[in-house]
């Protein structure tokens, strides 16, 4: 099915930027892996590099805005031609849950007071208003309430006395037309307007002031244009070249309103003075290859030893990563494609242990299913062994750093009757659904 | 049983052209995407066209953009490859094959045709 292809993803709002056109397949607008594309005109924005997770979305508003609740966040798959990292397809949606708490306390409402004594009325003739206020202390609101109902009232007054009304120009009305529109004309074209004294008219008791003034004003028409020519187009000029060498591109033709120019006022041509087309190099761009993830660190061994375990003797380890994804003469990893260190190895070793403080609390697991929880944890940490944080391997070559690798065996007090862990788990309040964003917008 | 079989190529001057063909069989060829990829002499394989099942799109490497000709008639279940302008390096065997040439997973290949220009 065609697409509308874009030149542009935009990783932080996940938005198409640069629209090249439509009409075109997923395949053609992808020769471009920096390109992107939609199904349809404000639909999901897919970018056509290999799938990967998008960056997790700000968490939504708490499900309450006081006391504890809960609330989501979620990131998505994109990209095309794949899938992102646990076999996941493109489109689909991952989850995440918390508890979460705006505001401890839940407002109050206060009380009023009694009203206070009318104020006098805003006018010294003719009718006005008078107002009268109260408090919101009886009692004080908590917590970011409010009294109900509003903390001032008002009412009509009348002073009994007349006010006299002055005479005021309502605006001037339209110039009459001239008596003709293009100069060189019989007559001497001539444009009269006028007004009326009525906004408001002068009053007669008690007596108001007229307008000043005339209630008319004629002047000559001067400066009429010579009567105009609408302009015209040329014709299209040749079809630029396509600007590049892989991919979809956008070639352009241009016209010029010269066929008559406009003249005395004329209208410009109507319409674009540039059109554009797609065109297609069917020459896919160059995909320059990323690196995997490190892998795991092998064992810490030393040569010609059996074993260095739990003994204070240094030893080396390497990890290696994979340059994938290079097509079509794009550039290879920048970079080592293995990483050496110095080690100790405690794979294994029984070490005096110690119990951490709580943990923070976890996610609310599972984020869309039912009656989620979250988790906190005391570990039994082991106490590593004093020994010598760097190395001097070979003269010259100065001091290296050496890591503890391997999982020793810790040995703790017993903990709630547990040795390595213990856990304490919370239901998860006022849980909101999970709903895809992209549908909530339709 | 599938079968892809080339024909065409030779030894050819500097400047001068081929047409190779590959006749398909043992499979639906009027539904299915193909390419030529070919094999330089101690070099890896290197993609070089693809045509989609109806040819009404085509794609080429950018070394042969404007020289190579992809074309397929699917009443005779058989791929071609124009080859004009030939260059020295465009030396090797080249292979019909069946699949998804962007991501480069082939299901089926042919024996493929050597391909020779040398002064």
């Known amino acids: 099915d065609p697409v509308l292809c874009f030149t542009q993803y935009e990783e932080s709002s996940g938005k198409c930027k640069g629209l090249l056109g439509g009409g075109v397949s997923v395949e053609d607008c992808c020769l471009n892996t920096a390109f992107a594309y939609q199904k349809r005109s404000g639909g999901l924005c897919q970018p056509c590099r290999s799938p990967r997770w998008s960056l997790w979305s700000t968490w939504a508003p708490c499900s309450v805005t006081c006391s504890e609740g809960s609330q989501l966040r979620y990131r998505r798959c994109v990209g095309w031609n794949g899938q992102c990292s646990g076999k996941v397809a493109p489109g689909t949606l991952e989850w995440q849950l918390q508890a979460c708490e705006d505001q401890q306390c839940c407002p109050e409402m206060g009380g009023w007071s009694g009203w206070g004594p009318w104020e006098p009325c805003s006018v010294t003739c003719s009718k006005g208003t008078r107002t009268r206020r109260r408090a919101c202390n009886h009692p004080a609101p908590k917590c970011g309430g409010h009294c109900p109902g509003q903390a001032q009232e008002s009412e009509a007054c009348d002073t009994q006395q007349v006010c006299p009304t002055h005479g005021a120009w309502a605006t001037w009305g339209p110039w009459t037309p001239c008596s003709a529109s293009c100069h060189g004309g019989p007559h001497e074209p001539k444009e009269t307007r006028s007004r009326k004294c009525s906004a408001p008219e002068p009053s007669q008791k008690p007596p108001g002031k007229p307008c000043p003034g005339l209630a008319y004003e004629q002047r000559r028409c001067t400066g009429l244009p010579p009567c105009p020519v609408a302009g015209g187009w040329g014709p299209w000029g040749p079809v630029s070249p396509c600007p590049v060498t892989c991919g979809l591109g956008q070639t352009m033709e241009q016209r010029t309103c010269n066929h008559p120019v406009p003249q005395h006022g004329g209208p410009f041509c109507a319409g674009d003075a540039t059109r554009t087309h797609i065109c297609n190099t069917a020459v896919p761009c160059p995909v320059d290859g990323e690196w995997d993830s490190w892998g795991e660190w092998s064992p810490c061994i030393r040569r010609n030893m059996k074993s260095i375990s739990c003994q204070e003797i240094p030893g080396q380890q390497s990890r290696g990563r994979t340059c994938r994804g290079r097509k079509f003469d794009g550039h290879r990893c920048a970079g080592q494609q293995q990483d050496i260190r110095h080690c100790y190895s405690i794979q294994h070793c029984p070490l005096k242990g110690s119990w951490s403080e709580w943990s923070t609390w976890g996610l609310c697991m599972p984020p869309c299913g039912p009656n989620p929880t979250r988790a906190r944890q005391r570990l039994c940490t082991p106490l590593l062994p004093k020994y010598p944080p760097t190395v001097s391997m070979v003269e010259g070559q100065g001091e290296k750093n050496v890591t503890f690798w391997g999982r020793p065996l810790p040995r703790c007090e017993e903990l709630q009757g547990q040795k390595l862990v213990v856990e304490e788990k919370r239901p998860c309040l006022h849980v909101p659904a999970c709903k895809d964003p992209e549908e909530e917008e339709l | 049983e599938v079968q892809l079989v080339e024909s065409g190529g030779g030894l050819v001057q500097p400047g001068g052209s081929l047409r190779l063909s590959c006749a398909a069989s043992?499979?639906?060829?009027?539904?299915?995407?193909m390419s030529w990829v070919r094999q330089a002499p101690g070099k890896g394989p290197e993609w070089v066209s693809a045509?989609?099942?109806?040819?009404?799109?085509?794609y080429y490497a950018a070394s042969v953009k404007g020289r190579f000709t992809i074309s397929r008639d699917n009443a005779k279940n058989t791929l071609y490859l124009q080859m004009n302008s030939l260059k020295p390096e465009d030396t090797a065997v080249y292979y019909c094959a069946q699949g998804n040439w962007y991501t480069e997973e082939y299901h089926y290949w042919g024996q493929g045709t050597l391909v020779t220009v040398s002064g």
């Open positions: 043992g499979f639906t060829f009027g539904s299915a995407d």
């Open positions: 045509i989609n099942s109806n040819g009404g799109s085509t």
